[in-house]
Each structure stands twice: as C-alpha cells, then as structure tokens.
C-alpha cells in the first residue's frame, strides 16, 4: 500500500523516526511511515526531489531553497505560541537613549544570537542586503558584515576569516573561556545573550525575537545582569527609519519569521500528509503517551523531526513556499542566499561602440587589479535591443539602459534592474518630472480631468515631456481614444487647438499648429526648431504665458527657468513662479515647487538590467565597491567609472552625470523602477503602434 518516507538527517533523528514509525504502525495510522537516512537537510531535499524520500520538516531558509531550487511545497506547519500562531518576529533592539535607526546601522556595534541563526543573522543580514543598505561583493557576506558594523558578537564566527571583527564584542564565560562559542559558554549567545550584549553596553543594537526584551526585563529574568533592566529603556527599529516601543513588534519588525513546515514534492497530496501527522499528534503529543512527537529529550538532542516547542501541527492552505514564508522573510532570504560556489566568475557587460569597448576593457583591468569580483568581461552588440536579446540568451549578463529601453527589456525580454544611476540635483536633463502647467486662475480653474476642449502647448512632436508622456497618459486614462491608431487626429480632436511643432508636417492635422506663431516675421510657423517661438520647453511655456494656450506640457524645471528674473527675454522678464500651478493626476492643483508629488510621470534614471536569475545583490555589490575606488571623477586609482572624456565619447557604460550607483531596493521589476505613471504613458503610446 501507500507509504510516506520521512527523511532523517542524523542518527538521533533516525532513531526517533523509527520510534515514531513503530508508534504509528501500532496505532493503526495509515499510510505507513518509513524512515530514510539523509546526511543533511540539503541532502534530504535532493532525495525528496529525486523521489527517494517524501517528507521532511525544514526551517524558513531551507523551505526557500527547497521551493525555489527543487519545486517542493510546504503542506503542514508547526504552531508554537497561541498568541503569534505559525510564526514569530525578528526585531532589532536599541537603547532608548541612543540615536540609532535602521538607516544608521553602519559603524555601530552589533549583537547577534549566533552565526546563521534565523533572527540573529539570516533575517537582519538578508534584510540589510535586500534593502540596499549593505552591499556584498562576491557573495562574501561575512566580510561585508564585518566591514559594515563597528565590531560585533556573532557566536560561532570564531572559525571564520573575520573573527577579529565578528567576535570583537564577545566575552565568553565568567572565566573568559569559550569566547565567541556558539554555545552557552559565550555569555552573549542566544536570544538572551544577544540582548545582554546590548543591555551591558557592549553593543548598540541586538537582533533578537519579539519576545526577548519582555522576557528579560522588568524583573522577569533570574540572572543578576537583567535584574534592574526596564523594558521601557529599549526600543525597536522599524523598517521605515522610525523607532517604536518594544511592545509594538507586530508593526515594527524586520520580518515575520515563518514556523518550520513539512515539505513534500509538488505532486504529493498535502492533505494525506496532514491526516497522517494529525492522527499522530492526536495520540502522541500529550504527556504520558508512549511516544512523544514533540520531544527529543529521550534521544539526548533537541528539535528532532519537529521543534520541541511545537504545540500542534496545522494544515497549510496555500501550498506554495512564497505564501508560507511571506514577503518580508522571502525578501530577506533573497538578500542572504548567495552561494560563492555558484557565483559565475565573470560578469559579461554589453558594449555598443568602439569607445565603449575601450572603456569597458579599462574597467575590467582596473577591477581585476583591485580584486573586485566577479570579473568584468566585455561583449559587443549592435544596439540596446541586441544587448537585450543576448542577455536573454545568456550570452551576456548586464547592460545600462535608458527608460524606454528598460521598458522593452522588462516587457519583451523579461529583464530586471540590478542597480540604478543617481544624478546630482543640478543634472535635471537626465532624470526629470513631466508636468502640466496652467495659469493660477481662481475664476476659470480646471483640472487634469477637464482638459478636453482646452488649448494645449507642447515642446514638439515626439518630445518626452511635451508629447510622449502627456499624450500617453491621456490615452491610458481613457480621455483620448484614437481610432485606427491615429493618435495625431485623436489629439487634434481632443484639444480645441494646440501648438505641437514638427519636422515633417505631411498629413499633420492643422489644429496641432493652430497656436504656433513662427519667428518674429511670422514665418516658419510650427517648425520643429527654435525658429518657432513656441518650440521646445521654453517655447511651450511661452505659449501659455502669452495666453495662446491654457496648459503647457513641460519639464519640472521649465517654470523656474523662465520666471523670477531667471530669463531676461522681454516675454519672461517680469514673470513670477507663484502665478502658475501644476495639474495633478488626482484632480488637484499644486504649487510649481511641488513637482515631485504632482506630475504626470518621472523620466527615470538609467538602470543596469540583467536576467531575473542573476543575483542582483552581487551586481550591486560589485558596482558599490568599484565606485568607492573609481566613482569620484577626481580619483587617483587609474580609472573613472562615470567619466567618458578619456575615450572621446559620452555616457559610455554609465551616464557621465552619474554621481553614484544605487541599489534598486524595492524596485525589483522594470515597472517598479520606471514607476507606474511612466509605464502607463509608454503603454498608452505603444498601444497605438499598429
């Protein structure tokens, strides 16, 4: 008949499994339970995937790996504490008197429950990496952490290459024995030890679980070190940069940590596994029963087959590893799980020209000299689109792309952003907001939803802020509805009249030139250059100023460039910025200074795009270490990442205006990086490409 083969990872576990199998058989529980011996949890996962075993209980990190790499699913969960259910929370605790926040952890002294422990290491380190606060080069997480904190106590890190930093705060027992041991010999080991490390002032932050502070303060703790501690003297660090009372762990934590769960192959009936275990726990989970499912005392170990603290097993409704782990924990695991043995030795960068090949070659040499990992290789392609094709085909790994190309790379080729560029505020030509400007007019005020029939001013046909974004946005919002892909006619019928300067006016609707004025002699009307006085962003704003139009679609800088004395031309000399407003997508109006909150879209910075199976944290880790050495245009290290002047070109590999590479943070998809408004505008326009 049917049988379930449980995978045991050690002799004591095999022993307990045998006893459980026997107890279930004697109780007549079906299907029968057999035991298979694996060498480790990882090995058991491989055995299950290979159909040589069927089930094992795993912790969150292992569930992530088993699900992601082997397609296993969680079907039965452990429950420990009625208050929190099938999970607990990983928190970061600081002294109330300190000024530490989640954003200022760099350089502070840290206390951890132990190396590779869930709340003491995996969650905080994974979270810091995933959120972009901690960059890791070449999967060397230990080095990254040792460089990041200003000394730590990470029990168990004594055998690593970075013990000087990672064990610096550890103190061992009262006689100085067992320093940095992953055992109670180290006074700062485990939850209470990590908290003690903080409480005694050795560290500035402790990574523990939600209940740790309350269990070790306000007279609840027996040891002398905790007798006088008050819970009110400590606070939690929240992910948004704020802090909260230690009782607020449900709202303020690093991640909800899922309980351990039983995993099986995707084709295994989860209900069957639960029924088997449910029968078992009904008979064998209370004191006095012949076999104790949730105790390992008889075997001289802890947490065999199930955690000893399990109060019951419950069925898992949504049997996917993502749903069980939850997004917070899932994200932390993404940041943490980086196997140096599986890290490709090279990152192949896509290059598009001879100067770019030269700069890329120099970058590869410079990075190699500084032992940066992975090493750079340069691979040529004919165009950005060709780069995308080659990346998708796994012939190349990375390329820096502009907004429209990022859209294509994501939508058509499935690529994702791994790092972004950041520009100085003065460099508004590289990333800017598209705004709709109107006169401040209380008697005839209208909103973005009331543009039909108004007169419009545009920088020019095909200009991003003057045409593509506003028209795309109005199409996407359903205000402009082109028939047979004829956008020009649809726009000309939507607005009462417009000025949209153009280079090739063949079959161009006359109303799109109706507001244009040409040069001083009235010639060159509607031409796509500065002979048309209403051409360009300055011209579109002038069209509004001179009352030719009711709305101008321009960049966020345009009003400031032409008011308050910033433009001495007669038409602009006396203009005040306060006399103009912005139309917001939510139907409101706003001051022109509120462009970041009231705009049609932001033209996004360039981003480095990679395949979704590429570890984005190793890409950013490489670039972040590289920019420390080569990011400053005045550096003396022999290569300038963000300068192309030595190669007689511009914007090679990265835009020259870049002041630093930034992590993508939560913007892990092309849509996230581009922003919903920009994507909507592009989709509005691309829906008309027939």
């Amino acid at each position: 008949g049917m049988e379930v083969r449980w995978c045991a990872t050690s002799d004591p576990e095999q022993h307990k499994c045998g006893n459980m199998s026997e107890a279930f058989r004697e109780a007549g529980i079906q299907p029968s339970l057999l035991c298979v011996r694996g060498t480790s949890a990882d090995h058991c996962v491989q055995l299950i995937a290979a159909q040589e075993a069927d089930a094992i209980t795993l912790d969150g990190g292992a569930i992530y790996e088993a699900g992601k790499e082997h397609g296993l699913k969680p079907v039965v969960g452990e429950v420990y504490d009625q208050e929190v259910g099938t999970s607990y929370y990983a928190v970061a605790v600081v002294r109330r008197s300190s000024h530490v926040t989640i954003d200022t952890l760099k350089g502070v002294k840290s206390c951890h429950t132990g190396i590779n422990r869930t709340v003491g290491w995996n969650v905080p380190v994974g979270y810091l990496v995933e959120s972009g606060r901690l960059s890791v080069m070449g999967c060397d997480v230990l080095k990254a952490v040792s460089d990041y904190f200003g000394g730590s106590c990470v029990p168990g890190a004594g055998e690593t290459s970075y013990s000087e930093s990672l064990c610096r705060l550890c103190r061992g027992d009262s006689s100085g024995e067992g320093v940095c041991d992953k055992s109670p010999l180290e006074r700062y080991y485990d939850y209470s030890g990590a908290f003690r490390c903080l409480a005694e002032g050795a560290g500035d932050v402790a990574f523990v679980k939600h209940s740790t502070v309350l269990e070790n303060t306000d007279g609840k703790t027996l040891p002398s070190w905790g007798q006088a501690l008050l819970s009110q003297d400590f606070e939690l660090l929240c992910r948004d940069g704020s802090r909260a009372d230690v009782t607020e762990w449900r709202q303020c934590h690093l991640a909800r940590v899922p309980a351990h769960a039983v995993v099986v192959r995707a084709d295994t009936d989860g209900g069957l596994i639960f029924r088997l275990l449910n029968e078992g726990q009904r008979l064998f989970s209370h004191e006095g029963s012949s076999f104790q499912m949730f105790s390992s005392e008889a075997y001289g170990q802890k947490d065999l087959l199930f955690k000893d603290s399990t109060s019951e097993l419950v069925p898992i409704a949504t049997q996917t590893y993502e749903a069980w782990l939850g997004h917070e924990y899932l994200h932390a695991m993404k940041g943490l799980l980086c196997d140096p043995n599986r890290l490709p030795p090279y990152l192949r960068w896509c290059v598009l020209s001879t100067p770019e090949i030269q700069k890329c070659g120099d970058m590869a040499v410079a990075f190699r000299r500084q032992r940066l990992k992975p090493e750079i290789q340069c691979v040529s392609a004919k165009s950005p689109q060709h780069c995308m094709e080659r990346i998708q085909a796994e012939q190349v790994d990375a390329v820096t792309l502009s907004g429209e190309d990022i859209y294509t790379a994501g939508k058509t080729y499935g690529l994702v952003p791994a790092a972004g560029e950041h520009y100085a505020p003065e460099d508004s030509s590289n990333s800017y907001y598209v705004v709709a400007v109107v006169r401040r007019d209380s008697s005839h005020a209208f909103t973005l939803d009331e543009l039909r029939g108004k007169r419009s001013c545009h920088a020019g046909f095909g200009s991003p802020a003057g045409w593509d974004v506003p028209v795309g946005a109005l199409i996407q919002r359903g205000f402009i509805r082109p028939k047979d892909c004829d956008v020009l006619t649809a726009v000309s019928e939507f607005f009462n009249a417009s000025c949209v300067p153009v280079n090739n006016p063949k079959n161009y609707p006359s109303s799109l030139c109706a507001l244009c004025v040409g040069d001083e002699q009235g010639r060159n009307k509607c031409v796509g250059n500065s002979q048309e006085r209403y051409y360009g962003y300055r011209g579109a704003f002038r069209c509004l100023v001179e009352n030719a139009g009711d709305v101008a679609f321009v960049r966020h800088t345009t009003v400031f460039d032409n008011t308050n004395g910033h433009n001495s031309e007669p038409w602009a000399a006396e203009l005040r910025s306060e006399d103009y407003e912005l139309l917001c997508p939510n139907g409101a109006r706003a001051e022109v200074s509120q462009f970041a909150a009231c705009n049609l879209a932001q033209i996004p910075p360039h981003a480095v795009m990679v395949r979704p199976d590429t570890n984005i944290f190793t890409v950013y880790g490489l670039l972040d270490k590289a920019q420390d050495l080569f990011g400053d245009d005045h550096n003396k290290n022999g290569f300038k990442m963000f300068d192309s002047s030595n190669y007689h070109g511009q914007d090679l590999l990265f835009k020259d205006a870049t002041v630093r590479a930034v992590p993508v943070g939560e913007k892990t998809t092309y849509r996230g990086w581009l922003g919903l408004d920009y994507v909507a505008a592009l989709e509005g326009m691309s829906s008309q490409q027939c």
Partner: antibody, heavy 119, light 112 residues
C-alpha cells in the same frame, strides 16, 4: 518661514562617532535636498553631503568612508554621523537646504553647532 | 579636486564706496543644461552663512540691490555698489555644477 536647527553633543572623544540631528520646520524633508556643511575654526566651508527627497544619499568622496546621513520623515529630521573622528574634525557643523527655486544653492542654513573632538 | 580661487583674500573698504570680489573656477561651470551653478554667500561675524546670489546673478529674496553678481565660464565677480557697515564679514563663492559642491577660500571684507 523655513528654519533648520542643529542639535547634538558639543564634545566627542577621538575615535568615537559624531552624531548630529537637524530639525526642519516650515518645509518637508520629502522635497528638496538636505545638506551638511562644516567649517573648522577660522577656516573655510567644506561640503559633507546630502540626503535627497527620495532618501538617496551623496557624500563628499574625501569623507565618504566615515559619513552616514539618514532621515526620519515622521519627525521631519535628518541626521549626520561621522565615525572615527580626530581633532581635524573639530568644526562648526551646519545643516542647509537646497531646492530648485534657487538652482540648488543653499538657501536656508541652521545656526550651526560647534563640535570639539578632544579626549 | 575642483578648485575655486577667490581674490583678494582681504578687502578693506571705505563706507559708501564700491567693492568687488573675484572668483575663478579651475574648469568651466556651464552645466549640460546650459545653467551656470555659481552662488555667493555672506557670513557675518559669529553667524551662519547666508545666500546672497544664486546662478551667477540672481539675488536671493531679501538681499539688498546694492549686491550684484556677474561672470561666465570660469570667471565671476560679486560687486557691492556702496558698502554699508552691516556688510562686514566673509564672502564665499561656491559652485555646484560639479560634484561635490565646493567653496572658495573666502574674502574678508572690513571697513577701513
């Protein structure tokens, strides 16, 4: 009226971390760029870095390895941390705002706070 | 690094007389958008710096019209048409076209 006010300890020991906070009123730190500048006694001004409206930071390369600028939007405050300080870090530290309206010149400054590094 | 050089470093002026301070940049300050991000600050004794002129020639709100700025490329000038007693202090030019923003070494204006 926009006002900025620096606060923090006036004395820091060598090798320790200098921590200052700038409290902003009359404007939101979620728009514009928020900066730190310092001035050693009797000397000129040195730019330290900024935190942008979206929370991205930029640091002067000469100080980058030791600087962290962060913000707490709920309190409308931003902070400076400078680690491993020496006597050369003794200075008046200013916070200041930069916005597009003045082409990212520093239009409003705090009154400054003197930080002395000494044992 | 990007260097801003001011001259003179000390400027004794008679009340009511004009004053002129020069500032030279080690490279052009014309940015890719065509703007020149050159600003002037005044620091009165014991006070924090105060913005006087931004983008070469634009007076900040509340700044008296006796202050004016001019120049282009790498050479810039701050002029005070008639010096008053409250103008005593140190004047700094600053650029933010290139990162990081940098300041001149300062010109100390004093009354003769």
């Amino acid at each position: 009226q926009v006002q900025l006010q620096e606060s923090g300890p006036g004395l820091v020991k060598p090798s320790e971390t200098l921590s200052l906070t700038c409290t902003v009123s009359g404007d939101s730190i979620t728009s514009g760029y928020w900066n730190w500048i310092r001035q050693p006694p009797g000397k000129g001004l040195e730019y330290i870095g900024y935190i942008s409206d979206s929370g991205i930071t930029y640091y002067n390369p000469s100080l980058k390895s030791r600087v962290t600028i962060s913000r707490d939007t709920s309190k409308n405050q931003y902070s400076l941390k400078l680690s491993s300080v020496t006597a050369a870090d003794t200075a008046v530290y200013y916070c200041a705002r930069r916005t597009l309206a003045t082409y990212y010149a520093m239009d409003y400054w705090g009154q400054g706070t003197l930080v002395t590094v000494s044992s | 690094d990007f260097v801003m050089t001011q001259s003179p470093l000390s400027l004794p002026v008679t009340l009511g007389q004009p004053a002129s301070i020069s500032c030279r940049a080690s490279q052009s300050l014309v940015a890719s958008d065509g703007n020149t991000y050159l600003h002037w600050y005044q620091q009165r004794p014991g006070q924090s710096p105060r913005l006087l002129i931004y983008r070469v020639s634009n007076r900040f709100s509340g700044v008296p019209d006796r202050f004016s700025g001019s120049g282009s490329g790498t050479d810039f000038t701050l002029k005070i048409s008639r010096v008053e007693a409250e103008d005593v202090g140190v004047y700094y030019c600053s650029q933010s076209t290139h990162v990081p923003p940098t300041f001149g070494q300062g010109t100390k204006l004093e009354i003769k």
